[in-house]
């Protein structure tokens, strides 16, 4: 008799990443009988919610339901109806909501309450919405990339899944850049983690990991730009800010009230003799780089060594996956290739920033001007953060791998978060059965 396919014995999970600039919904799928195996969970869908991050809904919380509708309806379509009730849904909010909570717990709670009520209206198994800590964000990002790279598997392969995968079992470090924060997470080599706040201990698949992590709140690309503008306007002689981080010919009016809206600019706040100022781009990479460096306080370090702002950072070790905005920005700038040296990246950035704004607009006609205008700053910021902030060098630059997806799953904290909450990463190595259950009879 002919083999007949049995109904797929699969499970699904949904995680919403409520970031500072936008929300994305991820749908994951895995074979039910293999949920403790490493590398079996994969992403089947990403749905980017149209609109800003949830922290921007403070004044219009009633619009949150509509905002989430399209992606939640997409999840309803992708996941078979028979699976809806047992599909967990998690929402994790990151630095944008941490900043809102810092200003007001009441406003942050109100946004989350409305989010929870909206998500509870769907047929899935809603597990709650919460603000995750920076430490969690870093840790789950590290778990995600190492899970997808097969680093937790005890079976050493003779082949590589992805081009930059080394065949050893050394884990990759994780570099995550968002709009409001950035995380660095890795296993240091025989180094004591001098600051308890930055130390994590994991036992995964029978192996112990001592992991360093830190989340730099306000050092995501968008908040770093607000910081830089607030710092530079302090010394401007009038309401014109000649800015090297924007293309020559670029002009934009900024409200001072918007500049001081975020806790990130608090240290630069001052009474200005104007309500608005105009950014006028002059497009100079070197000057932009110098201005960005002023955001990193390297004059004080209470440990054997620091990143910046007195935060402990052990010596860098091994390869790193740089994802989220590290990847999106470098991808746009066409600088993600393994073959591009740090010197070459700097050279390309110098040329890119010097290009006139009118020329840039013509070359990238399909890109929203708001995003397009900020690539010079963002690219320069990435270089400054990696080199001066985290102490990568021209030599160690080749250990940074700009990653968007690994085997079809986005690099980011969401997969690690779901694996943890669904208990799919066992502390001990599961006993492997001689034959896995076949889906055919």
């Amino acid at each position: 008799t002919q083999n007949k396919a049995l109904p797929e014995n699969v499970k699904y999970g949904i995680v919403l990443d409520a970031g500072s600039s936008h929300t994305s919904l991820y749908i994951y799928k895995w074979p039910a009988e293999k949920e403790n195996d490493t590398g079996v969970v994969h992403q089947v869908e990403e749905c980017r919610v149209k609109g800003p991050g949830i922290s921007k809904f403070v004044q219009k919380v009633n619009a949150i339901g509509i905002y989430l509708t399209a992606c939640m309806e997409r999840a309803r379509e992708v996941i078979p109806r028979s699976q809806h009730q047992e599909t967990p849904v998690y929402l994790g909010a990151t630095a944008g909501m941490r900043l809102l909570r810092m200003e007001s717990e009441e406003l942050a709670d109100r946004v989350l309450d409305v989010v929870e009520r909206s998500l509870s209206n769907y047929p899935f198994d809603f597990q709650g919405a919460r603000i995750i800590t920076g430490q969690e964000e870093g840790a789950y990002g590290w778990i995600t990339i190492n899970y997808l790279l097969g680093k937790f598997s005890q079976k050493t392969r003779w082949f590589s899944i992805v081009p930059y995968e080394t065949n050893n079992q050394e884990t990759f470090g994780a570099l995550d850049l968002g709009g409001a924060s950035t995380q660095v997470t890795f296993v240091p080599q025989n180094q004591t983690i001098e600051s308890p706040d930055n130390a994590l201990q994991f036992r995964l698949y029978g192996k112990d990991y001592n992991v360093y992590t830190h989340s730099f709140l306000c050092y995501g690309k968008d908040q770093a730009l607000w910081q830089k503008l607030a710092k530079d306007i302090q010394v401007a002689s009038n309401e014109i800010l000649r800015d090297p981080c924007f293309h020559p010919g670029y002009k934009k009016v900024v409200n001072v009230s918007d500049l001081y809206k975020t806790p990130c600019t608090k240290r630069f706040e001052m009474t200005l003799p104007f309500q608005q100022f105009e950014i006028q781009g002059i497009g100079n990479y070197q000057q932009c780089h110098q201005s960005i460096l002023e955001l990193f306080n390297t004059s004080y370090c209470p440990y054997s060594q620091c990143a910046f702002n007195g935060i402990f950072l052990p010596p860098l070790q091994g390869d790193f996956g740089a994802f989220s905005a590290f990847y999106f920005v470098m991808k746009f700038l066409n600088l993600t290739s393994e073959k591009v040296s740090q010197e070459k990246v700097t050279e390309m950035m110098k040329k890119f920033c010097a290009q006139p704004w009118e020329e840039i607009k013509t070359s990238y006609a399909g890109v929203k001007e708001k995003y397009l205008s900020e690539y010079c700053f963002s690219g320069t910021y990435i270089l400054s953060l990696l080199l001066q902030g985290y102490h990568f060098t021209a030599d160690s630059w080749e250990h940074i791998h700009f990653i968007g997806k690994i085997q079809g799953s986005d690099a980011g904290w969401t997969l690690g978060y779901m694996l943890n909450l669904t208990n799919m990463i066992p502390a001990e190595q599961p006993l492997s059965t001689p034959l896995s259950h076949s889906t055919y009879v």
């Epitope: 909570r101 009441e106 109100r110 920076g134 706040d197 709140l217 608090k266």
Partner: antibody
């Protein structure tokens, strides 16, 4: 659990300065602002100001501006308040409190006595 | 500055009865659909303890007999039934705008 541990009582002379501390534990220190509150005669509560531990930026009640300085040491997770040019009016209990707009956690207070 | 007027200044209530303390703000303390009004209990030698936040939400571990209500400029704290342990000073506070301000306090005792 969240705890705020304040430094001990101070007896200071008029015109002098005092610097008190507030050591935080049980949460990410840089994720919340630290406020300072004065309580005189066991009744009147006055908000002095707050500091953003993340970057050291601060906001004050105009009444205390110029006389109070708020600082933090993020590596030791400690907030400090210095009060200068003290008079007998400054004899009070001073509290640190964690929060954005919700003061859910308070230190036990530092009693300052200004006396010649 | 927003002035908070608390009344009465002192109050004596029998065990099991209801205690009502009111707090009036010189201008609305509502913003974005939230009332930035808080109630604290303070016992001698202790720091204030958060009872109510956002005008009507109970703080962590606060007994259900403490109820907050109101919006805009008029707020009240109700304690029912009154227990011996409720003898304390009670303060309202607004954090809608800087400078954050407190009411003058109400001394609650047992009759």
């Amino acid at each position: 659990e969240v705890q705020l541990q304040q430094s001990g009582p101070e007896l200071v002379k008029p015109g002098a300065s005092v610097k008190m501390s507030c050591k935080a534990s049980g949460y990410t220190f840089t994720d919340y602002n630290m406020h300072w509150v004065k309580q005189s005669h066991g009744r009147t509560l006055e908000w002095i100001g707050y500091i953003v531990p993340l970057n050291g930026g601060s906001t004050f009640n105009q009444k205390f501006k110029g006389r109070a300085t708020l600082t933090v040491n993020t590596s030791s997770r400690t907030a400090y308040m210095e009060l200068r040019s003290l008079t007998s009016e400054d004899s009070a209990a001073y509290y640190c409190a964690r929060g954005g707009t919700r003061f859910a956690y308070w230190g036990q207070g530092t009693l300052v006595t200004v006396s010649a | 500055d927003i002035v908070l007027t608390q009344s009465p200044a002192s109050l004596a209530v029998s065990l099991g009865q209801r205690a009502t303390i009111s707090c009036r703000a010189s201008e609305s303390v509502d913003n974005f659909g939230v009332s930035f009004m808080y109630w604290f209990q303070q016992k001698p030698g202790q720091p204030p303890n958060l009872l109510i936040y956002g005008a009507s939400n109970q703080g962590s571990g606060v007994p259900a007999r403490f109820r907050g209500s109101g919006s805009g400029t008029d707020f009240s704290l109700n304690i029912h039934p009154m227990e011996a342990d409720d003898t304390a000073m009670y303060f309202c506070q607004q954090t809608k705008e800087v400078p954050y301000t407190f009411g003058g306090g109400t001394k609650l005792e047992i009759k």
